[in-house]
């Protein structure tokens, strides 16, 4: 009888089923929905998390202007197809044979088509801009304190290497967090910026994916940082391909 058997849960993903049937009675966890093995020492991929969710019952101080190629996730939730490593498959289709191409964070990057649509490769999202607006406070937060707290959060809670947090911008009440991670920069074992951003997004919404941890309690020098609006922009290594009709709509 081991400690693993006493507490056989996945600290980094509560959307799992775990049982102590691994080597030496160790805890082995599988994601809901897909049944895929989950590494509980790190973040679970966004694709597996979305699949689990669908299976469950219901430096300059100036702000960044997202580029014309930035994507926002307007399509919302869908039941994705994940590859054997838990990443999004480049082509996603729904039950009515409508298909589209997605990037590495699962956001649609082409017009919708039929089963003949081809998505040759999974295009990497290398730059994520998280745009937050905080609730009114007595005064503005100190920028360097805010910067340090958000960097600490991504390092400690989401295990994202500090080099991938490119910048934190602040103009009260807007905070922007820039995450950058090129294919060449991401080493084996590195948390993906898309996964970190998704965990952060769920935390901000009060829907923490961590097992048994309290919700996110963000404080800057003891002052609560309460977010009232979140927008996330995704920039891909190859610009998306939408028809002019969509761009002018």
């Amino acid at each position: 009888h081991t400690a693993a058997q006493d507490n056989c849960t996945c600290p980094t993903n509560k959307m799992t089923v775990c049982s102590p049937d691994g080597p030496g009675g160790r805890c082995q966890c599988r994601a809901l929905g897909s049944g895929m093995a989950v590494d509980c020492s790190t973040l679970t991929s966004k694709c597996l998390l979305l699949k689990a969710r669908m299976s469950a019952p219901k430096n300059a101080r100036t702000l960044v202007r997202p580029s014309e190629h930035a994507l926002v996730d307007n399509d919302g939730l869908y039941d994705p197809d994940c590859d054997p490593e838990g990443r999004f498959k480049a082509r996603q289709c729904n039950q009515t044979s409508v298909c589209w191409c997605v990037n590495s964070v699962g956001v649609r990057r082409t017009d919708k088509g039929d089963l003949s649509l081809r998505c040759d490769e999974l295009v990497r999202t290398h730059h994520i801009l998280i745009d937050l607006r905080h609730r009114p406070t007595a005064g503005a937060f100190n920028h360097s304190d805010l910067d340090a707290e958000l960097r600490r959060l991504f390092r400690e809670r989401y295990r994202l290497h500090p080099k991938f947090v490119a910048a934190v911008h602040y103009e009260q009440p807007t905070i922007q967090i820039e995450l950058r991670q090129n294919t060449s920069q991401k080493a084996a074992g590195d948390v993906d910026i898309g996964d970190a951003a998704y965990y952060f997004e769920r935390d901000i919404k009060g829907e923490s994916l961590f097992q048994g941890r309290g919700g996110l309690d963000l404080r800057v020098r003891g002052e609560p940082l309460q977010v009232e609006r979140t927008l996330i922009y995704y920039l891909d290594e190859i610009p998306p391909k939408f028809s002019m009709k969509r761009l002018t709509a």
């Epitope: 691994g22 966890c29 093995a37 590494d39």
Partner: nanobody, 121 residues
């Protein structure tokens, strides 16, 4: 790119033996923990046996303990599973997997396509 290629499966009578091999490439095999897992028809993946990177520690599922032996040759980047006294319930697709073991948790992150083992008279 991680690649795992199993071989050695086949049809064998109850009580018989087989030796499976798994050729690994695309990652530093000599520093990777490895496992054998199996999937019986219509069932989920079942962990069978585990070996650490230098071969000094092994574990076996209760269902195969005393009958199966896991080993590895790091100079050849190859993992082995010697299966003796085979039973009908051992019939499954056998896959080798790269694994990770901590004090409390176990996970596999890459699997081969598998080799079929059928035990029947």
């Amino acid at each position: 790119q991680v690649q795992l290629q199993e071989s050695g499966g086949g049809l064998v009578q109850p009580g018989g033996s087989l030796r499976l091999s798994c050729a690994a490439s695309g990652f530093p095999f000599s520093s990777a923990d490895m496992s054998w897992v199996r999937q019986a028809p219509g069932k989920g993946l079942e962990w069978v046996s585990y070996i650490n990177a230098d071969g000094s520690k092994t574990y076996y599922a209760d269902t195969v303990k005393g009958r199966f032996t896991i080993s590895r040759d790091n100079s050849k980047n190859t993992l082995y599973l010697q299966m003796n006294n085979l039973r009908a319930e051992d019939t499954a697709v056998y896959r080798c997997a790269r694994a990770k073991l901590t004090d409390t948790h176990y996970v596999e992150d890459y699997w081969g396509q598998g080799t079929m083992v059928t035990v029947s008279s």
